[in-house]
């Protein structure tokens, strides 16, 4: 799988995580910080 950084327009796409561009899927993926979940790392869990 080819991975690169997200385009600048997607700054802020991931609320609590790192934005990764999955080239082969032509979409972003959020790698969430510990304690966060959701497509955009928008949910906090204990």
């Amino acid at each position: 799988v080819s991975i690169t950084k997200c385009n600048s327009d997607m700054n802020g796409y991931c609320l609590h995580g790192q934005c990764i561009y999955l080239v082969d899927m032509s979409q972003n993926y959020c790698r969430c910080e510990v304690g966060y979940t959701g497509v955009r790392c928008e949910h906090f869990y204990l």
Partner: antibody
């Protein structure tokens, strides 16, 4: 399956406003950005702007700034594009498009005709 | 706004010909360019993204290359079903389409 269903064709007088809706099903608009693109008859594609429905953050093309308003209602999974002070050159098909980086899913388009 | 200058605006070629379309960005777009095909009455279809990544189901005669501000889209052997208008799209910073290239059969 995933769908974007837009409102029907509109005929407007110059100076009026139009509001086009775009209802999503099969996915949550909060997971994406919703972009708006238009195409005048026989002309090219023109990006107008986009909304991040989760953050309610909008970005517009400079030429439309102050004339276009993009909104989203996450409770109904619907996005809207309102264009004011219409002129004849705004006659076009208006598309809403789901994106997570790319334009990966298009609505069927809404024809807006501006005519006196 | 980033400007995308696409050329030519139209071209006529024979079946089997190699067809090349170029797009020049007003600033570095870091390979974030896509190419779309649009046929009359249809929504655009994504062919290539991130400069050179072919979408599933797209024939291998379509290809893309480039970096920085200069990008190229190529049809290696034009087929009758390729008659359409092609657009580049930069998606590094917001979105901008090129003006389009109408491809016709000679």
């Amino acid at each position: 399956q995933d769908q974007l269903v837009q409102s029907g064709a509109e005929v407007k007088k110059p100076g009026a406003s139009v509001k086009v809706s775009c209802k999503a099903s099969g996915f949550n608009i909060k997971d994406t950005y919703i972009q708006w693109v238009r195409q005048a008859p026989g002309q090219g594609l023109e990006w107008m702007g986009r909304i991040d429905p989760l953050r309610r953050n909008t970005k517009y093309r400079e030429k439309f700034e102050g004339r276009v308003t993009i909104t989203a209602d996450t409770s109904t999974n619907t996005a809207y594009m309102e264009l004011s002070s219409l002129r004849s050159e705004d006659t076009a098909v208006y598309y809403c498009v789901r994106s997570r980086t790319l334009f990966d899913f298009w609505g069927q388009g809404t024809l807006v005709t501006v005519s006196s | 706004d980033i400007q995308m200058t696409q050329s030519p605006s139209s071209l006529s070629a024979s079946v089997g010909d190699r067809v090349t379309i170029t797009c020049k960005a007003s600033q570095d777009i870091h390979k974030y360019i896509a190419w779309y095909q649009q046929k009359p009455g249809q929504a655009p279809r994504l062919l290539i993204q991130y400069t050179s990544t072919l979408q599933p189901g797209v024939p291998s005669r379509f290809s893309g290359s480039g970096s920085g501000t200069d990008y190229t889209f190529t049809i290696s052997s034009l087929q009758p079903e390729d008659i359409a208008t092609y657009y580049c799209l930069q998606y590094d910073n917001l979105r901008t389409f090129g003006g389009g290239t109408k491809v016709e059969i000679k």
